[in-house]
């Protein structure tokens, strides 16, 4: 299984994914999971440097850059 | 402390099964994707398996598809791999590894394995 | 599969030597590429994850920088516990894949 092509779209909006609202679209493997229970963010590990700034955009495009964006670790799902 | 403890290797011979256990504690167990990794000596690491954080989805290396199969008990906090028709080339250390996943907005990335099992060792041989 | 080509595949350095590993990727992968440290005997440890992301606890003189097919691991002071073997490993698609490591050995 392989994601689509990545373009670098900056800090663009997140764009509607194909999953229903209580669902997260995981990009490794293409498919929506359960993931309503599992949202709440963890602090960010102090030393850590900023996660690779990313925004979500439409499964096509899988995901961009977008400078000092912070991502919310999650456990992990899959 | 975050820790994952291993057990259940040992020398087997080829065409035979062994299952091995993964206990985790420290975290929620339930609510992360677990992953079998491998290293046969001197060799490169090799993925072998994941399973969704509840049981409901697997993916297997071309290698060991349709031989080996990965599982999880959440009331027991514990992962496994069931290994079948064993070969002398499934000789390794295996790993189990957890799921490193970022969200981003309703996207999950994958971010590799953060927590390690200490690994147990295979070896296949008549 | 996407396959990951480290070089070199072992280096000679002295303690307090910059130290730069590289991996490509046989199709671009965003930046979905993690580094490990592994020691003799020992589980990986992850090091920098999504290229260039610092792993919590890791020194801050390890570094990560690439993206698409390029990706670089560096080392700006290395230090007697840096000795290890270092791996990539891509979190683009399944099958997830390493590559096959790159040994730092003691000058």
């Known amino acids: 299984m392989r994601r689509g092509p990545r373009s670098l779209r900056g800090r663009d909006a997140p764009a509607p994914t194909p999953c229903v609202p209580a669902e997260c679209f995981d990009l490794l493997v293409r498919h929506c999971v359960a993931c309503g229970l599992l949202r709440t963010p963890r602090p960010k590990p102090a030393g850590a440097s900023s996660p690779a700034p990313r925004t979500a955009l439409q499964p096509q495009e899988s995901v961009g850059a977008g400078a000092g964006e912070a991502a919310l670790p999650l456990p992990g799902l899959l | 402390e975050v820790q994952l403890v291993q057990s259940g290797g040992g020398v087997v011979q080829p065409g035979r099964s062994l299952r091995l256990s993964c206990a985790a504690s420290g975290f929620t167990f339930g609510s992360y994707g677990m992953h079998w990794v491998r290293q046969a000596p001197g060799k490169c690491l090799e993925w072998v398996a994941v399973?969704?954080?509840?049981?409901?989805?697997?993916y297997y290396g071309d290698s060991v598809k349709g031989r080996f199969t990965i599982s999880r008990d959440n009331s027991k906090n514990t992962l496994y791999l069931q290994m079948n028709s064993l070969r002398d080339e499934d000789t390794a250390v295996y790993y189990c590894?957890?799921?490193?996943?970022?969200?981003?907005?309703?996207?999950?990335?994958?971010?590799?394995?953060?927590?390690w099992g200490q690994g147990t060792t295979v070896t296949v041989s008549s | 599969e996407i396959v990951l080509t480290q070089s070199p595949s072992s280096l000679s350095a002295s303690v307090g030597d910059r130290v730069t590993i590289t991996c490509r990727a046989s199709?671009?992968?965003?930046?979905?590429l993690n580094w490990y440290q592994q020691k003799p005997g020992k589980a990986p440890k992850l090091l920098i994850y999504a290229a260039s992301s610092l792993q919590s606890g890791v020194p801050s003189r390890f570094s990560g920088s690439g993206s698409g097919t390029d990706f670089t691991l560096t080392i700006s002071s290395l230090q007697p516990e840096d000795f290890a073997t270092y791996y990539c490993q891509q979190s683009y698609s399944i099958p997830l894949t390493f590559g096959c490591g790159t040994k730092v050995e003691i000058k």
């Open positions: 199709q671009s992968i965003s930046s979905y």
């Open positions: 399973i969704w954080y509840d049981g409901s989805n697997k």
């Open positions: 590894a957890r799921r490193f996943t970022h969200l981003r907005g309703q996207y999950i990335e994958d971010y590799g394995m953060d927590v």
